[in-house]
């Protein structure tokens, strides 16, 4: 490295600073930048972050797990959309259990685990970002196939679960490539006096170039092609609705609705910043201010964006009445299985069996229809 | 042209207050940081602070904070550190130096003896 | 505050041999964003000090090539392939990734 020939001397005013030229390298900083302490914003992150890592943790693996135990006692007639959702809350639940170690490594203000460990959270917190999201895109491509396209719904749908499973198997095999390069970089390392799990790109020929990239990986497949189908699928499915007399199509348009705003209310900011920050990589001359700012801003989208995680069974799930049906009678036949338990002489294997036959002859009508989630 | 010129030789009495200059080229006062290092007889370099005449924002070692202030003045590209309540310790020369990137000293002043006595 | 220790304080050369000068830091020079900002200066008698390699081991431009920089983490060295008579003077190290930019107490080349 020594001796870059990379030459600023051009950007320098020759008649006064021709003598002091400075080889300096495309990842040099401003100096303002090593002076510019963001104590404060670490300060903020440190109390902020745990508090909302935990409650994303908790509600995230209360909704999720509930949308999975729906669905094991959900014997028949699973769509497309049921298989996504089942996957989804999955990855959601994997992504959530991850959690608790970045709290904790906020708190602390360094790393405090192994560098495997670093390396395996980073990887399977990024598999299930980036699962979960693709998973919204087959969502939104099954809804607009089953309402736009309805006639050919039947063709396209007809063998609904082997299809779903491959599907499903192609979406975490997609994410854990988009990923591996997670496993790669990251990994434990002192700097500045603590240790941090962080990419780190020194290994490369050129650091800043792979930082663009997996930036734009992340950008690409946690946001914009999400969101792309979303719009395409969803602008489609609105108009059709629109157009169908149906008594619930308001509702149905409700929800779709809810479901975009959602979406890019958590989503928008967060990749906005990483936006940002990719557009301020190459920048020398930035300013102390803006980088705290970033550095708060990054901060909260990033909590608003993992919110995401466990508004999904409430968006995909359990606005659903079908599927809150199911729940609820789920939710009454563990209390009859306690109480039964509880007290020998009262009985309720006959209305437990007769529930759950209950709900296989109320859904075998709807056996094509495209979830019991809308 | 020297690029950065110093104020020569300051004297002053123990809890006097003084202030020395720096005067910068336009485009080095615009564009860069300017930061101030004390050197002792015989002894090594104490970085004092830095300010960013462009921004404005100043930053200064704890060591010195209260007891120096920089500033500058657009008009006539000059930087400024004025000590005060002096004391013997204070005595050194000052160094005013541009720090363009990363942190380093690109180019110096002459430097000022500073005299407390 | 980041200490900068030198070895040896002062080095005896003779004209045309190399020079090795070393530098400890007390913590890791390696920052968040990859880079070791870690500087050399040489300051001659009577003179201001005049930056010779920045982070680690960039020559300034018009610095001749006999100069060289390495290390990692806490542990620099600064080499001069042939000293030449202009070489003599005091070599300071100087850290810009820890605030207070703290500098080594130099080590004095001089001819033996």
């Known amino acids: 490295m020594s001796g870059e020939s990379m030459n600023f001397s051009d950007v320098f005013d020759s008649s006064e600073d021709y003598f002091v030229s400075v080889n300096t390298s495309y990842y040099s900083v401003d100096s303002e930048m090593l002076l510019c302490s963001l104590q404060e914003v670490r300060q903020f992150s440190r109390l902020f972050v745990p508090i909302a890592y935990s409650l994303i943790c908790v509600f995230g693996l209360l909704g999720n797990i509930l949308v999975v135990i729906t669905f094991a006692f959900y014997k028949k007639a699973r769509s497309m959309t049921d298989v996504y959702l089942l996957n989804m809350a999955i990855a959601d639940i994997l992504f959530v259990l991850t959690l608790p170690f970045w709290a904790v490594s906020h708190a602390t203000g360094a790393w405090v685990f192994s560098n495997a460990t670093c390396k395996l959270l980073k990887g399977i917190y990024a598999i299930n970002f980036n699962c979960g999201m693709l998973l919204l895109t087959c969502i939104s491509m099954d809804r607009y196939i089953a309402i736009v396209q309805a006639t050919k719904s039947f063709r396209l749908r007809s063998r609904t679960l082997p299809r779903s499973k491959i599907i499903c198997l192609v979406v975490w095999g997609l994410s854990v490539i988009i990923s591996s390069s997670t496993f790669v970089f990251n990994q434990k390392y002192n700097t500045q006096g603590s240790d941090v799990c962080e990419p780190k790109y020194q290994t490369v020929s050129e650091p800043i170039r792979w930082k663009l990239l997996m930036l734009g990986l992340e950008l690409l497949f946690g946001f914009f092609i999400p969101l792309m189908f979303m719009i395409f699928c969803y602008t489609f499915i609105v108009k059709t609705l629109v157009q169908a007399q149906n008594s619930k199509r308001h509702k149905a348009i409700r929800v779709i609705i809810a479901v975009v705003l959602v979406f890019l209310a958590c989503q928008i900011p967060h990749n906005m910043v990483l936006l940002v920050t990719a557009a301020n990589l190459g920048k020398m001359n930035r300013s102390c201010q803006s980088e705290k700012l970033i550095g708060y801003t990054k901060t909260v989208t990033e909590v608003l964006a993992f919110l995401h995680c466990c508004l999904n069974p409430v968006l995909y799930a359990f606005i659903g009445q079908k599927f809150r049906n199911y729940f609820l009678k789920i939710l009454k036949d563990l209390w009859c299985v306690r109480r039964k338990y509880k007290s020998s002489g009262f009985s309720c294997a006959g209305r437990y069996s007769e529930n759950i036959s209950r709900q296989t002859s109320e859904t075998a009508d709807n056996d094509n229809a495209s979830s019991f989630t809308m | 042209q020297d690029q950065l010129q110093q104020s020569g030789v300051a004297l002053a009495r123990p809890g006097a207050s003084v202030k020395l200059s720096c005067k910068a080229s336009e485009y080095t006062f615009k564009s860069f940081g300017l930061g101030w290092v004390k050197q002792r007889p015989g002894q090594g370099l104490e970085w004092i602070g830095e300010?960013?005449?462009?921004?404005?924002?100043?930053y200064y070692n704890e060591k010195v904070k209260g007891k120096v202030r920089l500033t500058a003045d657009k008009s006539s590209n000059s930087v400024y550190m004025e000590f005060r309540s002096l004391t013997s310790e204070d005595s050194a020369v000052y160094f005013c130096?541009?720090?363009?990137?990363?942190?380093?000293?690109?180019?110096w002043g002459q430097g000022t003896t500073l005299t407390v006595s | 505050d980041v200490v900068m220790t030198h070895s040896p304080l002062s080095l005896p050369v003779s004209l045309g041999d190399q020079a090795s000068i070393s530098c400890r830091s007390s913590?890791?020079?390696?920052?968040?964003?990859?880079?070791?900002?870690l500087h050399w200066y040489l300051q001659k008698p009577g003179q201001s000090p005049k930056l010779l390699i920045y982070?680690?081991?960039n020559r300034l431009s018009g610095v001749p090539d006999r100069f060289s920089g390495s290390g990692s983490g806490t542990d620099f060295t600064l080499k001069i392939s042939r000293v030449e008579a202009e070489d003599l003077g005091v070599y300071f190290c100087?850290?810009?990734?820890?605030?207070?930019?703290?500098f080594g107490g130099g080590t004095k080349l001089e001819i033996k």
């Open positions: 100087s850290q810009s990734t820890h605030v207070p930019r703290t």
């Open positions: 300010i960013y005449p462009r921004s404005g924002n100043t």
């Open positions: 913590q890791s020079l390696l920052h968040i964003n990859g880079n070791t900002y």
């Open positions: 982070r680690v081991s």
């Open positions: 130096a541009r720090s363009p990137y990363d942190g380093y000293f690109d180019y």
